[in-house]
Interface confidence: medium
């Protein structure tokens, strides 16, 4: 069971300081941006991180949404990352959900975050280069100290 607490507005960056944004095709991508670029591209660079109470002690449960014309929420259904047109629900009556991630702080690095899927234990949000694009994907953690699954989260409100 997950019960919604409150939400905050955040900018999410990978460890190469590229900014996460949602493009015109609703794809989550990373791109080099100056602070003014980041502001100019809002609301596509501003993510709504909603925190949830978890009935099991597993960590800080969150959803990640973005509001352009409508609110879309990040999903990892079938281990494929996409934004689905939906509001983060007030309650989820299950112990796992494709839209719930556990936001974890890397031991020894309080400012570095990981987002582990509640549906797929051991799978994390990651940045992966595909041709010329830096995409947000779901990835099984397979190597120690994998920087691709680490992010910084900067609160905007």
């Amino acid at each position: 069971y997950f019960g919604k607490l409150e939400s905050k507005l955040s900018v999410i960056r990978n460890l190469n300081d590229q900014v996460l944004f949602i493009d015109q095709g609703n794809r989550p991508l990373f791109e080099d941006m100056t602070d003014s670029d980041c502001r100019d591209n809002a609301p596509r660079t501003i993510f709504i991180i909603s925190m949830y109470k978890d009935s099991q002690p597993r960590g800080m449960a969150v959803t990640i949404s973005v509001k352009c014309e409508k609110i879309s929420t990040l999903s990892c259904e079938n281990k494929i990352i996409s934004f689905k047109e939906m509001n983060p629900p007030d309650n989820i009556k299950d112990t796992k959900s494709d839209i719930i991630f556990f936001q974890r702080s890397v031991p020894g690095h309080d400012n570095k975050m990981q987002f582990e899927s509640s549906s797929y234990e051991g799978y994390f949000l990651a940045c992966e280069k595909e041709r010329d694009l830096f995409k947000l994907i779901l990835k099984k953690e397979d190597e120690l100290g994998d920087r691709s699954i680490m992010f910084t989260v900067q609160n905007e409100d």
């Epitope: 607490l5 925190m51 002690p57 960590g59 800080m60 702080s105 890397v106 120690l144």
Partner: antibody, heavy 119, light 110 residues
């Protein structure tokens, strides 16, 4: 770097209660779990329960259910552990431990508080 | 009460490699991650390994963890006198809905 500072040593009579505090400084407090772990003299570690201050409710190990109460005050970044109906076998060092990665990965520990239960 | 089994003591000479075992069951290690803590004499425990084999920053790469089935082990290479301490394994236990520690292993550097 987060620091957890615990209250001082206590001597208590059997049947009484003790309340130990744990103040966090230098880092995020509210969204991470604070656990309480005890260690009897010359013995191993024993988890008692935890709280995620932001959630406001605690989880307790079965063994301590009904006898331990874990609370947190977000405004002062302080967690508390109260143990009631004390007996001599509760004599131990009580540690608070922060868990930022996972509620059960204790990456930061307080210095410990010795609680002695003696008549 | 102790659900995870560790040898009470191990020893090794400086520069040697030692391993500490931790044996559990399908309700804990078999289906969950293992963490290791080091407790130097008179001090609070310190996280050494988390999620089976991850080292927090600041922990030397002489320390490594592994897991297979319902057992886990901690390996320390290039043993140093400052490694003399108690070592505890820890895992989540679904049957007791609790986290469990091993009984601890005292490492002596000869």
């Amino acid at each position: 770097e987060v620091q957890l500072v615990q209250s001082g040593a206590e001597v208590k009579k059997p049947g009484s209660s003790v309340k130990v505090s744990c103040k966090a400084s230098g880092g995020t407090f509210n969204s991470y779990a604070i656990s309480w772990v005890r260690q009897a003299p010359g013995q191993g570690l024993e988890w008692m329960g935890n709280i995620i201050p932001h959630y406001g409710f605690a989880y307790y190990a079965q063994k301590f259910q009904g006898r331990v109460t874990i609370t947190a005050d977000e405004s002062t970044s302080t967690a508390y552990m109260e143990l009631s109906s004390l007996r001599s076998e509760d004599t131990a060092v009580y540690y608070c431990a922060r868990a930022a990665y996972h509620p059960l990965v204790f990456d930061n520990w307080g210095q410990g508080t010795l609680v002695t239960v003696s008549s | 009460d102790i659900v995870l089994t560790q040898p009470p003591s191990v020893s090794g000479a400086p520069g040697q490699r030692v391993t500490i075992s931790c044996s559990g069951s399908s309700s804990n290690i078999g289906n969950h991650y293992v963490n290791w803590y080091q407790q130097l004499p008179g001090t609070a425990p310190k996280l050494l390994i988390y999620r089976n084999n991850h080292r927090p920053s600041g922990v030397p790469d002489r320390f490594s963890g592994s897991k297979s089935g319902t057992s886990a082990s901690l390996a320390i290479t290039g043993l140093q006198s400052e490694d003399e301490a108690d070592y505890y394994c820890q895992s989540w236990d679904y049957s007791g809905f609790s986290t469990v520690f091993g009984g601890g292993t005292k490492l002596t550097v000869l």
